[in-house]
């Protein structure tokens, strides 16, 4: 049977699944999919890790703690109603038939408030950026302050650069993802 | 074998500050999340919060925000608790601790800590 | 946070007697759930983690079930050395948050 999570559009998700490392560097590879456990692997893969690191992920799913100390939650980034289902944990110890498997629901809410659509004249003024930081749980969101003004151009162009920069990978693999609003 | 040894008792005047150490010895910090722990006399335990030695990431309960600032130093293999703007109500023993990651396997002997005028 | 409800508080028991403590969490856990020992005077001692799984070393009379929010310590046959205060704690989110305690005394 699967346990339930909950989770509201826009927000970050956050599946829960650990496992104790036999000895500290001795990873286990381990799996995340969408839909429920099958008897072996995971259907769907949305993130896997290997012995040494994170192998492959999908865009919006990234371990939020340290795999490295079998920490292997999983944060779906700004999720949607799309989103909601069984996703499977799977732990892949060593052995016939030893995995730990961890089938998880999750229920994504509507949002509580839909804030009115932001005219163009909105961007143009100073505004804050949302940093939302590596965590343990439901993402923790503070301001940063004194940042520079920026215009709707400008945000246009940083968020491709974004998508393929370093910075997007330094972020991916800190766990953080910056918010713009 | 592991061990966890913390710096000994203090008592420090109200408004002052206090550092804790926690030497590890029998493993390395940076494998694991290090924790600290609040119990006052005859009460429960507390989770202040907790650092990943490897990046420095730390973590804290809300009531020890700005109270409680965990750091380590991995070439000595020792996490550090400092806490600030002591009251009376911070008189407590404080444990630090090693996590497995989700549950705490080994535990320092704790350090006394009195809060007096 | 999640909130950890331990009950009973306290509790009064003659050797030999089967003994269950409770812990509620306040939401969803799955089996993130570990239970300690703590005699009096000296530093918790894990017994239980992941719900269920007995730490290394610790006697087979202690034993732990329950997932999602009720879990459910349990001691088969109470010894003099298992005299302690016993807290449940939960590893899931941060914060990590502990019971309150439930304090096992000699009738």
């Known amino acids: 049977s699967e346990v339930e999570y909950r989770a509201e559009v826009g927000q970050n998700a956050y599946l829960p699944c650990f496992y104790t490392p036999a000895a500290p560097g001795n990873l286990v590879p381990v799996c995340w999919g969408k839909g429920a456990c099958p008897v072996f692997e995971c259907g769907n893969v949305v993130l896997r890790t290997d012995e040494r690191d994170v192998n492959y992920w999908t865009s919006r799913y990234w371990l939020n703690g340290d795999f490295r100390k079998g920490d292997v939650s999983l944060t779906i980034e700004n999720v949607t109603l799309a989103d909601s289902g069984i996703y499977c944990c799977r732990i892949q110890i060593p052995g016939i038939m030893n995995d730990e498997k961890f089938n998880l629901k999750l229920v994504i809410k509507p949002a509580k408030v839909t804030p009115a659509p932001t005219r163009q004249r909105d961007f143009t003024a100073a505004f804050p950026r949302m940093l939302t930081t590596r965590g343990h749980g439901p993402a923790e969101t503070q301001t940063l302050g004194s940042l520079p003004d920026i215009n709707l151009t400008q945000i246009s162009t940083l968020a491709n650069e974004l998508r393929d920069s370093r910075l997007a990978n330094d972020l991916r693999d800190s766990g953080a993802t910056i918010r713009i609003g | 074998e592991v061990q966890l040894q913390q710096s000994g008792a203090e008592l420090v005047k109200p408004g002052a500050s206090v550092k804790l150490s926690c030497t590890a010895s029998g493993f390395n910090i940076k494998d694991y999340y290090m924790h600290w722990v609040r119990q006052r006399t005859e009460q429960g335990l507390e989770w202040i919060g907790r650092?990943?030695?490897?990046?420095?990431?730390?973590k804290y309960a809300p009531k020890f925000q700005g109270k409680a600032t965990i750091t380590a130093a991995t070439s000595s293999n020792t996490p550090y608790l400092q806490l600030s703007g002591l009251t009376s109500e911070d008189t407590a023993v404080y444990y630090c601790g090693r996590s497995n990651p989700y549950y705490f396997d080994y535990w320092g002997q704790g350090t006394t800590l009195t809060v007096s005028s | 946070d999640i909130q950890m409800n331990q009950s009973p508080s306290s509790l009064s028991a003659s050797l030999g007697d089967r003994i269950t403590i409770n812990c509620h969490a306040s939401q969803n856990i799955n089996v993130w759930l570990s239970w300690y020992q703590q005699k009096p005077g000296n530093i918790p001692k894990l017994l239980i983690y992941k719900a269920s799984n007995l730490h290394t070393g610790v006697p087979s009379r202690f034993s732990g079930s329950g997932s999602v929010t009720v879990f459910t310590l349990t001691i088969s046959s109470l010894q003099p050395e298992d005299i302690a205060t016993y807290y449940c704690q939960q590893g899931q989110n941060y914060p990590y948050t502990f019971g309150g305690g439930t304090k096992l005394e000699i009738k």
């Open positions: 650092i990943d030695p490897e990046d420095g990431e730390t």
